[in-house]
Amino acid sequence: TQHGIRLPLRSGLGGAPLGLRLPRETDEEPEEPGRRGSFVEMVDNLRGKSGQGYYVEMTVGSPPQTLNILVDTGSSNFAVGAAPHPFLHRYYQRQLSSTYRDLRKGVYVPYTQGKWEGELGTDLVSIPHGPNVTVRANIAAITESDKFFINGSNWEGILGLAYAEIARPDDSLEPFFDSLVKQTHVPNLFSLQLCGAGFPLNQSEVLASVGGSMIIGGIDHSLYTGSLWYTPIRREWYYEVIIVRVEINGQDLKMDCKEYNYDKSIVDSGTTNLRLPKKVFEAAVKSIKAASSTEKFPDGFWLGEQLVCWQAGTTPWNIFPVISLYLMGEVTNQSFRITILPQQYLRPVEDVATSQDDCYKFAISQSSTGTVMGAVIMEGFYVVFDRARKRIGFAVSACHVHDEFRTAAVEGPFVTLDMEDCGYNIPQTDESTLMT
């Protein structure tokens, strides 16, 4: 995952649960018991906003040590600060845990900028606002890091929710979610509702804000509207999916669909932006520029360098187009589309110098490692990571930011042929997957 774009957030947990709706009649296939319905204790268990990551409270060790942990579907290690660091408010103290077991093995994780390294062990882990279970999980105790923890953040570790294939040091290190499913009766599925604020939050507002929900082991009906549509997980490493078509305001970008997935497309809660391969990014920006040409935005805006501002309350949402990504469906030759609004891809930014205005950053950026459907996408939707059935579900989020004219959408089915051809086959080499 793109560590450089993930910024932490100062906050504590809490907040009253949302009211739950009664389960609706739907035309969806029935699923095994325990996978749907009401998960009151898990609703609102995340804090955060798109620019700063989303984190959940976890406890580690005996007696339990409480830590805030970044929820990251783009990596697979459970790693926590385990030594004093100027940017950490607290850290995991292994010597205070009677249940800690040392694996006598080190782990080193480099990023493009920075790295973390630590010692592997296992300990008892639970999620206070999660399922009422305790599991023995692998923990990377971070003893040294460079440009990993960020000043002013309120998280002390990272929960990698992807598959063992991209775990460090190798795929023999069982990720947390695998351990959870193996050791308990929790179904092999989790779902995320990330709620972007739609306006910049100062520190005191963040403390009181609701960030979203991570429902472990199920699907909560109160968190979405309409139907869930599923796309296959192409390969169990990252949460890799296949995009078959892209539209800006209904206009097809008309690119070879392989370009959309070059060299992969992943769903990653640990990345802020919608990141697109270079050619796709350039075509998308050209199209968005054309659609919004009633105003002249600086080149730096499209690069994410310059903010654009409007007098408070006057943001002209209507001049910006909607963006639709068509995803491969579960049925042969069938796809569905997810549509986001400018309220998702223009990220509100608080800048003291321009505090009298509403200012935004363009949250679509260029990638050299494929498409990354980060928080910008996920904030529009309730996303179900159905690992048991090797699929990812999307439905319109009950908390997405929209206006009176347009709403995010999940629609289908559409007939799309030769979708398998849209996947890119990465040459088999020893992948340094985290070097992105």
């Epitope: 450089g4 774009i5 910024l7 700063q52 493009t112 000043n151 600086p298 080149d299 930014v349």
Partner: antibody, heavy 116, light 107 residues
């Protein structure tokens, strides 16, 4: 309070290099690009280039390619500019400036004097 | 590169007067223009962005106007502390460029 604290005055020999620093505080360093601007005595302002601290992406004014190299250290919230093969033409005050809308925040400047 | 021209290098005014500093862009830059004030021995201070928006804390005697290629910074009720050099800047496209500056002298 947002502050950009620049390193002190530099007196350097022709042909050598110098590395200037700009330590940011009061905001999340990786959220905003950092720019560098040159001002020769009694003259106007000249944009050198910029760096995105979150990805280390850089963009230079063509006039300064090969002359200036921009880097960041995100752990300390510091931006750096290295100037190489110095000549008397490089004697100037150099400012770092944070992006937002245009350049809302500026450092106090670092004076570089190139002299033998 | 876009050339920003401030044709008047110096302007003389009196306390309480109104003065207008002009800036011309060599091509259309929309409203992507900023104005800065630089006092002797100090770093530039941001006054105006998006051609006409005042940065927080800037006195309302400073107003900006214009779009396309012609821009104006107006200081009404000039104060002695306004003695400074004023620069315009286009941030519409790279490389960002500045005007040559206009020095305001107080009579």
């Amino acid at each position: 309070e947002i502050q950009l604290q620049q390193s002190g005055t530099e007196l350097v020999r022709p042909g050598t290099s110098v590395k200037l620093s700009c330590k940011a505080s009061g905001y999340t360093f990786t959220n905003y690009w950092m720019h560098w601007v040159k001002q020769r005595p009694g003259q106007g302002l000249e944009w050198i280039g910029m760096i995105d601290p979150s990805a280390a992406y850089t963009n230079y004014n063509q006039n300064f390619k090969g002359k200036a190299t921009l880097t960041v250290d995100t752990s300390s919230g510091t931006a750096y500019m290295q100037l190489s093969s110095l000549t008397s033409e490089d004697s100037a005050v150099y400012y770092c400036a944070r992006s937002g809308v245009a350049f809302p925040y500026w450092g106090q400047g670092t004076t570089v004097t190139v002299s033998s | 590169d876009i050339v920003m021209t401030q044709s008047q290098k110096f302007m003389s005014t009196s306390v309480g007067d109104r003065v207008s500093v002009t800036c011309k862009a060599s091509q259309n830059v929309g409203t992507n223009v900023a104005w800065y004030q630089q006092k002797s021995g100090q770093s530039p201070k941001a006054l105006i962005y998006s051609a006409s928006h005042r940065y927080s804390g800037v006195p309302d005697r400073f107003t900006g106007s214009g779009s396309g290629t012609d821009f104006t910074l107006t200081i009404s009720n000039v104060q002695s502390e306004d003695l400074a050099e004023y620069f315009c800047q286009q941030y519409n496209s790279y490389p960002y460029t500045f005007g040559g500056g206009t020095k305001l002298e107080i009579k």
